[in-house]
């Protein structure tokens, strides 16, 4: 049975040309974290592998960084980065866990973080 | 004590193909990522590829990237790497090694003794 | 990719001397730097790994020290079987790299 939750930095915004934190955390479950994907609609950001450490796909090499711990740093945003963002989490019993997380990237200086929420 | 041995290195002409084994004993093959760590005469070290525990995961270097894949079977405690479309720059020796867990801080810790791979025509 | 950028490329030492050799990484990598020693003809051999801990077996003379991307390895007294390359290594982000190598001679 999956007892884990995901709880997201949830629905954010930003400012053109800056950087955002994408961070997601797995809790409520002793199940093994294998491996943590990172994807944007259905396009591979990233891959943190606890074997092999992480993967940046090769299209998002100059604008993606790892970290700060399972987290993604998106770097030079532009109003085409707005969109939907999902933190897959594979583990060991349970299985697969997916976060989400909405990015609204904002031409002005208006951008604010949004509330956490959680994702059973 | 921890056993890496390499074999199936050898003399192969540009564009050929060889398959590298590396036989493991002493350790519990199946708890260990594994990787490919390859020098050129009188160069420094090149990583090459690695391996999941499980074999579900592998990464390549850009220069091997389409042209190398690397295996594992743990049922036989053996890493492989198949070589194809060689070129003269893969000239060099190709050791197998373990990989401590990314998790646990990383550091290739037991290395084998090496295969060399010579690509001349 | 990450470039490890290690200096001296060489350097010349005598028996009891402090050796210290510096590794810079081209971006950030946390504490994930590896150093290894190899002599020729063998294989390489891993000295520190996660930027400060001693691999198992590894005299107590050999200590690494950094975080993001400065690092250092040090020789606190330069042994006869010391003399060597040196090399450190980022396990941070695929594809993992290595540093061009520090020749550690007799003086």
């Known amino acids: 049975m999956m007892t884990g939750t995901i709880e997201t930095t949830g629905n954010i915004s930003a400012e053109k040309g800056g950087s955002i934190i994408l961070q997601c955390h797995l809790s409520s479950t002793t199940a093994q974290v294998t491996q943590v994907n990172w994807e944007q609609q259905d396009q591979l950001l990233a891959i943190c592998n606890a074997d092999l450490g992480w993967h940046i796909s090769p299209s998002f090499k100059d604008r993606v960084a790892p970290g700060p711990g399972l987290g993604l740093t998106l770097q030079s945003l532009t109003v085409n980065d707005t969109g939907e963002y999902f933190c897959i989490y594979h583990t060991y019993p349970d299985g697969t866990y997916t976060g989400r997380i909405f990015l609204e990237v904002l031409e002005s200086s208006v951008a604010e973080h949004g509330a956490r929420f959680q994702i059973p | 004590e921890v056993q890496l041995l390499e074999s199936g290195g050898g003399l192969v002409q540009p564009g050929g193909s060889l398959r590298l084994s590396c036989a493991a004993s002493?350790?519990?093959?199946?708890?260990?990522?594994m990787t490919w760590v390859r020098q050129a005469p009188g160069k420094g070290l090149e990583w090459v590829s690695g391996?999941?525990?499980?074999?579900?995961?592998?990464y390549y270097a850009d220069s091997v990237k389409g042209r190398f894949t690397i295996s594992r079977d743990n049922s036989k405690n053996t890493l492989y790497l198949q070589m194809n479309s060689l070129r003269a720059e893969d000239t060099a020796v190709y050791y197998c090694?373990?990989?401590?867990?990314?998790?646990?801080?990383?550091?290739?810790?037991?290395w084998g003794q090496g295969t060399l791979v010579t690509v001349s025509s | 990719d990450i470039q490890m950028t290690q200096s001296p490329s060489s350097l010349s030492a005598s028996v009891g001397d402090r050796v210290t050799i510096t590794c810079r990484a081209s971006?950030?990598?946390?504490?994930?730097l590896n150093w290894y020693q190899q002599k020729p003809g063998k294989a390489p051999k891993l000295l520190i790994y996660?930027?400060?801990s001693l691999q198992g077996g590894v005299p107590s003379r050999f200590s690494g020290s950094g975080s993001g991307t400065d690092f250092t390895l040090t020789i606190s007294s330069l042994q006869p079987e010391d003399f060597a390359t040196y090399y450190c290594q980022q396990n941070y982000i695929t594809p993992l790299t290595f540093g061009g190598g520090t020749k550690v001679e007799i003086k």
């Open positions: 002493g350790l519990t093959f199946s708890n260990y990522a």
């Open positions: 996660a930027a400060s």
């Open positions: 391996i999941s525990r499980s074999g579900g995961s592998t």
């Open positions: 090694a373990t990989l401590r867990l990314y998790s646990s801080g990383g550091g290739i810790d037991y």
């Open positions: 971006q950030y990598i946390s504490t994930y």
